[in-house]
Structure formats: structure tokens, C-alpha cells
Interface confidence: low
Amino acid sequence: MATAERRALGIGFQWLSLATLVLICAGQGGRREDGGPACYGGFDLYFILDKSGSVLHHWNEIYYFVEQLAHKFISPQLRMSFIVFSTRGTTLMKLTEDREQIRQGLEELQKVLPGGDTYMHEGFERASEQIYYENRQGYRTASVIIALTDGELHEDLFFYSEREANRSRDLGAIVYCVGVKDFNETQLARIADSKDHVFPVNDGFQALQGIIHSILKKSCIEILAAEPSTICAGESFQVVVRGNGFRHARNVDRVLCSFKINDSVTLNEKPFSVEDTYLLCPAPILKEVGMKAALQVSMNDGLSFISSSVIITTTHCSDGSILAIALLILFLLLALALLWWFWPLCCTVIIKEVPPPPAEESEEEDDDGLPKKKWPTVDASYYGGRGVGGIKRMEVRWGEKGSTEEGAKLEKAKNARVKMPEQEYEFPEPRNLNNNMRRPSSPRKWYSPIKGKLDALWVLLRKGYDRVSVMRPQPGDTGRCINFTRVKNNQPAKYPLNNAYHTSSPPPAPIYTPPPPAPHCPPPPPSAPTPPIPSPPSTLPPPPQAPPPNRAPPPSRPPPRPSV
């Protein structure tokens, strides 16, 4: 790569080299209607084309190459410029996003009559002029230069081309070189950002078509989506920015997420995680409902920006703190009620001779006479399903809308025995949406998960009440507080089966059997942990398996559902 001396600009400002970006997309941005690959990135694209005498008989191939490539950059925010050079550099078509102007520019390009020397640096000068002047609303758009030349540059001409390419780079451009025929790859690697930015065409001009896809793949920088696209007003969130080419900045520490709020203020945020196809960024806290933040990405610490059509909006979200307080009060009331209910059991112990046991009840009958549902029973003799102390590192893959794929992958405790019953409670099959997210059968409200849990709790309380009421002292029963008298008897007292540890022979460890649900109990909401329903495959690639140090962890919760 270039030395510091080579990169130094102007009158010796070596330190001013801004280590600007190298952006290489890992994959094609998308597909066009005709099925070919396309790029949806919003940046400025400059073609710097050699029209010296040596390409006289190959101009058609050069033109066709540019025309084919130009039609693959389809973002409405992408601007293009055609620059030709021989003994001087000429801007044939100034930077424009107007497709009609681009069509006319291509027509002008077709008419070019090559001739003259190879002053490539003049072409770079014309690009740098535009990069500097064509600022969009006060910020510089990311620029990509694709320079095409044939033959070797004379020593001085090479030096000047390199200097001017460095000037373009210092203005935020990424430089690619296409070398045809008798080019010097070492020279081009120094003019371009790196050797990886050189596209050698050794089989002559007719082979130019063969590199169109690889140029497209490497030069396409695009932002495709943000998740979530709606965030709660006044709350802090993390946004996943999906796209291509983020990982290949010359220095990933220089990647920034930029939020242009209501077309005025721009806030730049450092991403927590930079992957080739997505960024995990802290979203700015937007105080008001209805605010809009246009998403941009800089690969060079804010020197220039890749624009997109992705907008993040704010909405009103219900406050969870009220709900938390309400639940706390409810819990306290419940604790008091339980204390009031169970206190007489603690303090009034009935001492009676136990009657001989009745005939053994059928194990298949519950005390309400209904058949017992069979649930898996886990031998939880070893706690800490995630290793000693339950703190074995657990990696969470974040799926769309904050869901995780790990619920179905939790490790069970070592030596835990899972007994699956023959008959399971049947859950209604969730329907798949077109985006592979599951939707509950009934319309979901924000309180649906809580309601389901409260219903289940209510049923348990009713059953508990029925069971404990049998044990309550009747009027006239006497006894002393916490003064137990053991009754010697061969058979244990046969109370209703509410003991979780009731087994015919002592197990090596307690066996926990979840209480059976009442027949009218609704199925657990999707957030319920049992039974595990495999989550749909995430549309995002997984973040790095072990997050690097000093990087914030992924969001600890999915974003709240906007209030209906």
C-alpha cells in the first residue's frame, strides 16, 4: 500500500491523509426487474475514461462497458458523471441523478473521438473539482471513482495521476481502476485505493463485459433497511441498519450511522457492531411523536455520506412503569391475602387420629375428576442449565423486530432427565406471515401476554383455594400454634395431590411437575417458554459470536410494540 509520504497532500500535510474508505460489498445489492444484479446505493459515481490515441479502435467497447455498468446503479439518489482524458481532462457529463441527462451523457460518450496523450491526472482533477463543489445540503456525498486506462503511464504521468488520485481520496472518494491490455498493475494499484481495487482485463477490450458484475459487487455501497423503522418517542433504542459493504471500510472504526432529523439537524452515532451486511447503531432519542430521521452512513468518520431512502419515525408507546406499579400493588395485595389465608394453617394444627386409608385413587384422575394433562417432567437435580451458577456465556441471535432465536436452543441441565408424556396439550398452529414472523391466532393487544398469564394464575389460585379450604380448621377445632403431634401410622395421610414431590419411591432428586392447566385455560402466549416453538430463521445474519471488548451488548429487550 501507499506510504505516508506518498499519501501526503499539498504542502506536506502528511497527517492530513484521512485514511478514507475502501468499500467492497460482499454481495450484490439486489436484483433488477430484468433479473440482473443491481445496486441501490445513493452515492456519487465518476467514470474517468482514457480517450488517448491508443484506444481509438476500442472506444465502442469502452462505451458499451460504461453503458452496461451505468444501468445497474438504480438508486434515485445515485448521481453520475462522465469524465474523459487525453492531453487534458474534460467533464463530458456533470454530476447528475437525472436519468434523462444520463441517457444524453451516454450518447455524448458514444460520439467521443479518441486521440492525444494519457494525462490521467487531469481526469482526477475534474473529479475532485466536482467532489468539492457538489455538496448536497451542506454535507459531502460519498464518491466512487472508476478510472479506466490502457497502457502504462509514463513515470511522471504516473506520479501526477497518483497525486491527483490521492487528492480525490482526501476529499472522500474511493478509487477503482480498470486496466486494459498493456497496463501496469503495480501503477494502477497505487492510483487505486489498493490492489483489490484494480480490475485487470488481460484479454483485451472485448473482455470488459466480464468484469461488470465484479465491479458492481465491489463498488456498491447501499443501505437497504432499518429495523425497527418505528421507535418510541423519548426512548433510547438500537437500530439495525441492513445493507451491503459496511465491513470493508479502510478502518471500521471510522464507520458512522448518521440520522438527519426532520431534514435539519444531523446526529452521527458510532455503531456498536459493524458487519458487512448490517450495522447495529444506537438511535438518537427523538423526543416528539412523528419525528422523522433519514438514515445515512459514513465510512470515513463523516467526511462523506452514503444516502438512502430509509426513514425512521417515532410513535407514542404506552408507558410500562404504570403497569409495573399496578402489578407491584397487586402482588402485595396477593401476598397479604395469602398470608391471611394460610396463617390459620400455621397456627392451628388439628390433632386427630387418621382413619384407615380409602381405596387407592386412580392416578389418571385429578381431584376435580378431569383427566390430568400430561406435561414433561424435568429432573432438575442439577440447577444452572447454563453451566455452574447458570452463568455460562449465552449468545443471543437477534432476529427481526428484536425476537431471538435462542429460546429454542437453551441448554438443559447436565444429567437432567426429561420425561415426555404420551399426550401433550395441543396448541393451535400459529400462522406464518409472509415475512416469516408468527402471528397469534387472535388479535394481539399490548396486554395479551399479561392477560394470558393472569388467567392462568387465576385458575391456579382457584384450584389452590379449593385444595387449601379442605385443610382449613372448622369452627370448634382446637390446637396450638406450631405445636405438632406426630401420628404414628403405616399409611401417610391421603390429602389431595398437591405435593410436587409426591412419588412412589424417593427419587434421586426432586421431580418437578408443572401444575396441570384447567381445561378452559387459554394456550400460553407466544412469549411463554413452554413448549419451545422454533422461531423463524432471522432475516439478518448473526452478529460476531463473541462481541469485541468495549462494545455495547445487543439490546436487552425488543423494542416495545407501538400503542394501537
Epitope: 499539498g10 475532485s128 463543489y133 482526501d170 476529499l171
Partner: antibody, heavy 117, light 107 residues
């Protein structure tokens, strides 16, 4: 057409300061450095320092460090050179020139600064 | 900083060839340039790099390098070539250094 137009001649007393301007046209002002070169009567050329407007930070010759300040105003495409603590030996013609890093390809017409008590 | 040394005065007969030399340690030819200055005028770039002429400069001017010495050659000197010629380069800290100048007289 590239042009660099400098401000008019100045007469200053020793210890004073002088500020010479250089307004450019015909090219992207910020993309090129502007250097300042002076020439005392009957003497050779002497480089004082320069600035790349887009970055705003100047680079000075050792001899003038601390006495010279070079600035650029992008809005008016004008570069400035201010020399303080003037001495009689600072009497010279001061030139601004477009610096492409390997040559000064365009020069201003020069500004004569006379330091005399 | 580095110094560039030039011969103070060189004479040439009209139509003859003259070479002006510029010597300096660590001289890097790709930063080298030559300027012509006529009395009362601003300097004018006549050569840069090893042998690059800006547009408008006649082809009788040429440049060359040999070790630590730069040369500017005028082949077939004309009366209008009478002037002071300064060589210039950058030192290791990228500061610009000028030679002392050579006065070319066309006889």
C-alpha cells in the same frame, strides 16, 4: 482561466503587522494548496508556508514559525498571509501561488510590503 | 532544511544551448520544478518533474536528472529567454526549498 489577484502595496512600521490577501478564481479553491513566497529586493525566492483550504491548517517554514499566519476563506475563495513583528528585512514582494504539491503552477502578481520607520 | 545550489550567472549566445544546474542532497526529482522570472514580473513555471513542460512553454526547454543534480536545458536560446531561473523542490518534511537562482544572459 486560473487567476490569483493580490491586494495592493503596503507600508508598515517596524513591529507592526501586515495582512496580504490573495483572491483566486478559475478553479476549485479548496482542492489546491496556496503557498506564500517572498522575494526581497535583488534576492531569490523564499517559501514562507502554505495552506490547503479544505483542511484549514497551515504549514510554515521554520524561519517564519510563530510570526506568520496563513488562513483561507472558502466562501470568498481568498487566502490570507499575516506577518507580525515586522522588521526592515521583511521588506519584500510577497507572492501567493497555487501549489499542486509538486509545482507552483499559477502565481499572483505580487504585493510589495515596505517596512520603514 | 535542505539547500539547493545554483550557479549565479550563466551566459549563452543567441541560438546556442545552455544548461542550468541545481544541486542538493536528498533532491527528489518528482518534486522538482523550474521557474523563470523576468524583472518586475511574477515567476513562471517552465518545467516540473523530470521533464514535464506546462502548456505554453516552448519545447526548447527540457529537463533532466543525474544523481543529486537537476538540469534545465535551453536548446537554441532566444532573446526572450533572458531571465532569472530558480529551481525548487521539497525537503523531507515537505517544506519547499528554492535554489539561489541563476541569471541567464543571452548574448
Amino acid at each position: 482561466q486560473v487567476q490569483l489577484v493580490q491586494s495592493g502595496a503596503e507600508v508598515k512600521k517596524p513591529g507592526a503587522s501586515v495582512k496580504v490577501s490573495c483572491k483566486v478564481s478559475g478553479y476549485t479553491f479548496s482542492s489546491y494548496a496556496i503557498s506564500w513566497v517572498r522575494q526581497a529586493p535583488g534576492q531569490g525566492l523564499e517559501w514562507m508556508g502554505g495552506i490547503i483550504p479544505i483542511f484549514g491548517t497551515a504549514n510554515y517554514a521554520q524561519k517564519f514559525q510563530g510570526r506568520v499566519t496563513i488562513t483561507a476563506d472558502e466562501s470568498t475563495s481568498t487566502a490570507y498571509m499575516e506577518l507580525s513583528s515586522l522588521r526592515s528585512e521583511d521588506t519584500a514582494v510577497y507572492y501567493c501561488a497555487r501549489d499542486t504539491d509538486y509545482m507552483f503552477d499559477y502565481w499572483g502578481q505580487g504585493t510589495l510590503v515596505t517596512v520603514s520607520s | 532544511s535542505s539547500e539547493l545550489t545554483q550557479d549565479p550567472v550563466v551566459s549563452v549566445a543567441l541560438g546556442e544551448t545552455v544548461s542550468i544546474t541545481c544541486q542538493g542532497d536528498n533532491l527528489r526529482d518528482f518534486y522538482a520544478s523550474w521557474y523563470q522570472q523576468k524583472p518586475g514580473q511574477a515567476p513562471l513555471l517552465v518545467m516540473y518533474g523530470k521533464n514535464r513542460r506546462p502548456s505554453g512553454i516552448p519545447d526548447r526547454f527540457s529537463g533532466s536528472t543525474s544523481g543529486n543534480t537537476l538540469s534545465l536545458t535551453i536548446t537554441g536560446a532566444q532573446a526572450e529567454d533572458e531571465a532569472d531561473y530558480y529551481c525548487s523542490s521539497r525537503d523531507n518534511s515537505k517544506h519547499v526549498v528554492f535554489g539561489g537562482g541563476t541569471k541567464v544572459t543571452v548574448l
